[in-house]
């Protein structure tokens, strides 16, 4: 799986978890969530070769179609495939609230 | 959705569904397949920015960072959403066999 | 409604010919590969003939190469199996079948049986 115990462990250039750390208030602007501060949302990135964790059926055929016409733009892609939510504090006027905000956190990656 | 109602129709610089034939002799190198020659693929390419077609609450939090820190590299992509079969006719020896290849035609796309 | 409906079925003596049509309805026919399939008692279900479109060329079953020759008309929706010098071992329910080539969409028709016997 491409996810941290193999990804964060190898020097990996093909489709992999990578670390991303958000600031919400530094990184997006919002102000609204008092707690976490930020969280390691990660992120996934990495070029999809033949064959390199393939999603489905036609990211095989399109990374196939790749190697043999390098020239083309068609070419699979290295997006988030298992995600965990987040637990955050708000308030609404003086009363706090928590919630948890699904698909928050990448924890693999697959070639799309 | 990002299908071929809206894609093949307008000139769309984001992310959006891009026709592509794949003749399976000349551009994957495969003899196997007997019929049909080749088919409808498709793929999806182009831009994610913040909010256009978000697949999950990160692939928005990833392209609403990437706005406000646009120097860095993590971004969504650009993937396929819906999928569809590919009918095949192949031989086992002199024996014809007709099979349903899943997930070979991308219908629609999303930014993940 | 999806309809295929097979006819041409029956008892002809061995050597003897029939012609199987099977006229399919409530879906567009010409993104479809038409085929034949046949099931003998006691035996799998087994192509016996197959056409892709638009215009693919004809497959057939080892066994029934050289005798049997499939064809289909799409202005008609209509797909035929011609069986010239038949055996005994062709008796057997024969259906048709439509699967799209692209995409969801497989209808098969209700059968129809064809006993080769003297």
């Known amino acids: 799986a491409l996810d941290a115990a193999y990804c964060f462990r190898n020097v990996q250039d093909n489709c992999c978890l990578r670390p991303l750390y958000i600031d919400f208030k530094r990184d997006l602007g919002w102000k609204w969530i008092h707690e976490p501060k930020g969280y390691n949302a990660n992120f996934c990135a990495g070029a999809c070769p033949y064959l390199w964790s393939s999603d489905t059926q036609h990211s095989r055929v399109l990374s196939l179609y790749n190697t043999i016409n390098p020239e083309a733009s068609a070419s699979p892609c290295c997006v988030s495939q298992d995600l965990e939510p987040l637990t955050i504090l708000y308030y609404i006027g003086k009363t706090p609230k928590i919630e948890q905000l699904s698909n928050m956190i990448v924890k693999s990656c697959k070639c799309s | 959705a990002l299908d071929a109602a809206y894609c093949f129709r307008n000139v769309q610089d984001n992310c959006c569904l891009r026709p592509l034939y794949i003749d399976f002799k000349r551009d994957l190198g495969w003899k196997w397949i007997h019929e049909p020659k080749g088919y409808n693929a498709n793929f999806c390419a182009g831009a994610c920015p913040y909010l256009w077609s978000s697949d999950t609450q990160h692939s928005r939090v990833l392209s609403l960072y990437n706005t406000i820190n646009p120097e860095a590299s993590a971004s969504p992509c650009c993937v396929s959403q819906d999928l569809e079969p590919l009918t095949i006719l192949y031989y086992i020896g002199k024996t014809p066999k007709i099979e349903q290849l899943s997930n070979m035609i991308v219908k629609s796309c999303k930014c993940s | 409604e999806v309809q295929l409906v097979e006819s041409g079925g029956g008892l002809v003596q061995p050597g003897g010919s029939l012609r199987l049509s099977c006229a399919a309805s409530?879906?567009?026919?010409?993104?479809?590969?038409a085929s034949w399939y046949r099931q003998a008692p006691g035996k799998e279900r087994e192509l016996v003939a197959t056409?892709?479109?638009?215009?693919?060329?004809?497959h057939y079953a080892d066994s029934v190469k050289g005798r049997f020759a499939i064809s289909r008309d799409n202005a008609k929706n209509t797909v035929f199996l011609q069986m010239d010098s038949l055996k005994s071992e062709d008796t057997a329910v024969y259906y048709c079948?439509?699967?799209?080539?692209?995409?969801?969409?497989?209808?098969w028709g209700q059968g129809t049986q064809v006993t080769v016997s003297s």
């Open positions: 056409t892709f479109p638009p215009d693919g060329s004809p």
């Open positions: 409530g879906f567009t026919f010409s993104y479809y590969v």
């Open positions: 079948n439509a699967r799209r080539v692209e995409g969801h969409g497989i209808y």
